[in-house]
Amino acid sequence: SCNTATCVTHRLAGLLSRSGGVVKDNFVPTNVGSEAF
């Protein structure tokens, strides 16, 4: 799957939306790699 910075950001936004924002504080685009998905 796409691992560019923009793809990672959009995937994380989707994950946050689906989880209702209940994730670790450091779960932000610049801290996560593609393996997080």
């Epitope: 796409c2 910075a5 923009t6 994380l12 946050l16 932000v28 685009p29 610049t30 801290n31």
Partner: antibody
Framework: EVQLVQSGAEVKKPGASVKVSCKAS????????MNWVRQAPGQRLEWMGD????????NYNQKFKGRVTITVDKSASTAYMELSSLRSEDTAVYYC????????????WGQGTTVTVSS | DIQMTQSPSSLSASVGDRVTITCKAS??????VAWFQQKPGKAPKSLIY???YRYSGVPSRFSGSGSGTDFTLTISSLQPEDFATYYC?????????FGGGTKVEIK
């Protein structure tokens, strides 16, 4: 309110370098990647590179063959784009841009910095 | 690099018209495409990401579709403030690349 505020217009001679700044506010600067994009007069947008402000890791458009350097000052929440060995074709408006999730999910752009390269 | 070919390069339309702009990628980019609106002397404004998702605050008359290599931006009923240049962008691969733009002018 999220804002990306860029430095002012620059006029440079061919062969010189220019360093454009982009000060971020209204969000956690180190959480989101920062992109740099330019647009020459009447031309399409052109992506130059991005930086992870947290780690300092960068990706560059190889078209610029090492002429571009993107850096950040985390303490000042500011990103920089330096372009060296300027030529007339580098005359363009340079933009910083970042996709933010919190507080508002949006793709924010700076106002642009005009760089003119002329002898 | 992936080429993004936009068509038409310009079009004339009237307020209330339905406008369709297409973008073709030179290779598969999945749905990793964004659309931007730009007015003269202004920074681009993001409209669409992931081919079909509108950012908050973007009017519902703007819609995007497509996957793979073929993408479309549709303005269902053109408004006076929509006269601008529109760009597509792929972010599936580095370097990100943009289409050549479509200028939407008043007929």
């Amino acid at each position: 309110e999220v804002q990306l505020v860029q430095s002012g217009a620059e006029v440079k001679k061919p062969g010189a370098s220019v360093k454009v700044s982009c000060k971020a506010s209204g969000y956690t600067f180190t959480d989101y990647y920062m992109n740099w994009v330019r647009q020459a007069p009447g031309q399409r947008l052109e992506w130059m590179g991005d930086i992870n402000p947290n780690s300092g890791g960068t990706n560059y458009n190889q078209k610029f063959k090492g002429r571009v350097t993107i850096t950040v000052d985390k303490s000042a929440s500011t990103a920089y784009m330096e372009l060296s060995s300027l030529r007339s074709e580098d005359t363009a408006v340079y933009y910083c841009a970042s996709i933010i999730i919190v507080p508002n999910y949006f793709d924010y752009w700076g106002q642009g910095t005009t760089v003119t390269v002329s002898s | 690099d992936i080429q993004m070919t936009q068509s038409p390069s310009s079009l004339s339309a009237s307020v209330g018209d339905r406008v369709t702009i297409t973008c073709k990628a030179s290779q598969n980019v999945d749905t990793n495409v964004a659309w931007f609106q730009q007015k003269p002397g202004k920074a681009p404004k993001s409209l669409i990401y992931s081919a079909s998702y509108r950012y908050s605050g973007v009017p519902s008359r703007f819609s995007g579709s497509g996957s793979g290599t073929d993408f479309t931006l549709t303005i269902s009923s053109l408004q006076p403030e929509d006269f601008a240049t529109y760009y597509c962008q792929q972010y599936n691969n580095y370097p990100y690349t943009f289409g050549g733009g479509t200028k939407v002018e008043i007929k």
